[in-house]
Amino acid sequence: AVNGTSQFTCFYNSRANISCVWSQDGALQDTSCQVHAWPDRRRWNQTCELLPVSQASWACNLILGAPDSQKLTTVDIVTLRVLCREGVRWRVMAIQDFKPFENLRLMAPISLQVVHVETHRCNISWEISQASHYFERHLEFEARTLSPGHTWEEAPLLTLKQKQEWICLETLTPDTQYEFQVRVKPLQGEFTTWSPWSQPLAFRTKPAALGKDT
């Protein structure tokens, strides 16, 4: 099992959560493993139990405090360890000195709502969740709209290169059902990645007025 390819990846949500995934080919599903976090300049340590998410990967969330509390800063280094039980003792399987603000992945945007809808356009707004005040306005967004007969993968990406928590979708078809998703990414961090996509927001454009050209 030890010789199988293994990987340990963690991201900080910028507030009070470090989410980790541990994968190892050939490891037994019922292996008991945990992630241990040891910050270099904090008095707390934190542990979470890795739970299986697929045949060869496990995940857990290190909850560092209240969801909106700022538990780490740009100068913190957190030593992370994967520990797996082997008989009566714990064995270290992976180690990393983790710089939280170099490894960011924010929570998905929330509270998506239709502000105004017409026949050909729709104005949508959203909010960011549990994002650090350190970012100020240094965030970007990607959005996509699901049209009838298409898949999310086929939807063109709309890029918002600033902290803009709304969008006006145009050139839509009247009386048509659409879905909309958005995701967010801080500009900071060498290994920072996009948040998960938000929950889809379903909306329908207004029908064209009778007797008028569309």
Epitope: Q24, L80, Q96, D97
Partner: nanobody
Amino acid sequence: QVQLVESGGGLVQAGGSLRLSCAASGRTFSTTEMGWFRQAPGKEREFVAAITWTGRGTMYAESVEGRFTISRENAKNMVYLQMNSLKPEDTAIYYCAAARRGRAAVRSEGGYDFWGQGTQVTVSS
């Protein structure tokens, strides 16, 4: 790019000690997790020890725990493996490895991007 050059290998009697050194060149060394692996004749390359870039985290193969110590000196771009109470079964070529940039040190070879050429350690009984 990280270039790695090992030194310090040699012939030693069982129960003796050796200190292996790994000299690294490359700007990212000071924020890269490092490891040592070894390959005995006719066997697969196996994990020996690893260390995080600050030196706060270490891990060892069960077979060397308590006998070997991994350390590093970032100011000199060096990683060391102090090997005490050597046994004939420690005979192997020892390789220094640099983990993938920004990634954890793991026990599998696939987690490492850069490798040295190796240094021979022979333990006679």
